[in-house]
């Protein structure tokens, strides 16, 4: 079969190749090949200013294979498209394009957006959050004794992150002025912070809040922390009106 | 020199089966594809469909319901069969070969054969 | 299926004449087309396959060029022989279609 069209092409073509070579079944010195064994695929190859034809058994970037009873070639992919799977289905488009359902298109239809990573159009995606976990033991300066008010946080998780036009999230975090009932320190609970500060001065806007005011000293015994002249005292007093106390949300 | 020659009927009447054989001397109908084209009086071509080296076939499909090509490997012949025919399937028919995307596409044609539609 | 639009559908020229003919493919057809001629009560005959290769024995005056959608047959100096009229075919995926035909006539 292959010589006696192998034959009919040196009437056409005065170059053809009596030993055609990398699947061809018929080819000429001038064209490549002319026609392709059975399963494999016809295709031009651009070699400098001149187009070949090559027989493959896949067809390159850009190109899909289109089966015909006994003669498959390589046909080129929609100009938009770098990888088809058919001329109506593209499974990569080319730069500045999306990708949605084979399609390729300038901009997202409403409802998706564009993720510029996988150059596909994608479901807008929203924030979600969890419940709010239970608040905190109310603090004050990390510890939660030797004061009357302090703040107490709670947090919740992200769920889902937003893609790009979805939904932000809401706050993650949230913290409110608490008030507890007065109670002393334990030994234990003073710490290693308690002991330096019996030996210097207190550190400039800390809070009045930090320590009962003399009212309480009457009807508790006097720890080494509590012991302040007065002179100290009023410089607290001035140092705490200077410092407002700010509750931040953080998002 | 390859050459292509059609025979049948140049009369057929509406709603019968129009039959027409192209007979091939100088190549084998075992290599190649074997075509059948079609020109309305004083319009353009039409492609019709091809049976191929191996005798598989493919038609245009806005014919394919109507349209049976075969082959006599015996007599080196390939024929068409266009069924329920009216008057717009009056044409010149042509045979016509190619034998792959790298070469000349309908190298060589039959003279053609004028096929009248008419009760 | 790919439509084949083919302008004009007839001009007059002269002998010596350069004469240009398009085809345009409704889609990228990757150089996979070929140019007929036919004369009267003739079968067409094969001028140019692949876009721009001349079939043997084709005078060298008859040349094609063009990519993706748009295609041109050109006669750089129209001869008496060459008044008929020319198909463009595009071969790129089945079915195969033809253009409509341009006629050459004498002007």
């Known amino acids: 079969q292959n010589a006696s069209r192998g034959r009919r092409q040196r009437r056409m073509h005065p170059n053809v190749s009596q030993g055609c070579q990398g699947g061809c079944a018929t080819c000429s010195d001038y064209n490549g090949c002319l026609s392709c064994k059975p399963r494999l695929f016809f295709a031009l190859e651009r070699i400098g200013m001149k187009q070949i034809g090559v027989c493959l058994s896949s067809c390159p970037s850009g190109y899909y294979g289109t089966r015909y009873p006994d003669i498959n070639k390589c046909t080129k992919c929609k100009a938009d498209c770098d990888t088809c799977f058919n001329k109506n289905f593209c499974t990569k488009c080319k730069s500045g394009f999306y990708l949605h359902l084979g399609k390729c298109l300038d901009n997202c239809p409403e409802g998706l957006e564009a993720n510029n990573h996988t150059m596909e159009c994608v479901s807008i995606v929203h924030c979600e959050v969890s419940e709010w976990n239970p608040w905190s033991p109310c603090t004050k300066k990390g510890k939660t004794c030797g004061f009357k008010r302090g703040t107490e946080t709670r947090v919740r998780e992200i769920i889902q992150h937003p893609s790009a036009k979805g939904n932000l999230c809401p706050p993650t975090n949230e913290t409110r002025k608490c008030t507890v009932q007065r109670k002393k320190c334990q030994k234990g609970e003073r710490g290693k912070k308690g002991r330096e500060r019996k030996r210097k001065k207190p550190n400039k806007g800390e809070s009045k809040e930090a320590i009962p005011d003399s009212k309480s000293l009457e009807s508790s015994k006097e720890i080494p922390e509590q012991r302040e002249n007065k002179q100290q005292q009023k410089k607290r007093k001035v140092q705490d009106k200077q410092k407002s106390v700010s509750v931040s949300t953080v998002h | 020199e390859v050459q292509l020659v059609e025979s049948g009927p140049g009369l057929v009447k509406p709603s019968e089966t129009l039959s027409l054989t192209c007979t091939v001397s100088?190549?084998?109908?075992?290599?190649?594809?074997w075509n059948w084209i079609r020109q309305p009086p004083g319009k353009g071509l039409e492609w019709i469909g091809y049976?191929?080296?191996?005798?598989?076939?493919y038609q245009n499909p806005s014919l394919k319901s109507r349209v049976t090509i075969s082959r006599d490997t015996s007599k080196n012949q390939f024929s068409l069969k266009l069924s329920s025919v009216t008057a717009a399937d009056t044409a010149v028919y042509y045979c016509?070969?190619?034998?792959?995307?790298?070469?000349?596409?309908?190298?060589?044609w039959g003279q053609g054969t004028l096929v009248t539609v008419s009760s | 299926d790919i439509q084949m639009t083919q302008s004009p559908s007839s001009l007059s020229a002269s002998v010596g004449d350069r004469v240009t003919i398009t085809c345009k493919a409704s889609?990228?057809?990757?150089?996979?087309l070929s140019w007929f001629q036919q004369k009267p009560g003739k079968a067409p005959k094969t001028l140019i396959y692949?876009?721009?290769r001349l079939v043997d024995g084709v005078p060298s005056r008859f040349s094609g060029s063009g990519s993706g959608t748009d295609y041109t047959l050109t006669i750089s100096s129209l001869q008496p022989e060459d008044f008929a009229t020319y198909y463009c075919?595009?071969?790129?995926?089945?079915?195969?279609?033809f253009g409509q035909g341009t006629k050459v006539e004498i002007k």
């Open positions: 016509a070969t190619y034998y792959g995307y790298g070469g000349p596409w309908f190298a060589y």
């Open positions: 100088g190549d084998s109908i075992t290599s190649g594809y």
């Open positions: 049976i191929s080296y191996s005798g598989k076939t």
């Open positions: 889609q990228d057809i990757d150089s996979y």
């Open positions: 692949l876009t721009n």
């Open positions: 075919l595009h071969y790129d995926e089945f079915p195969l279609t």
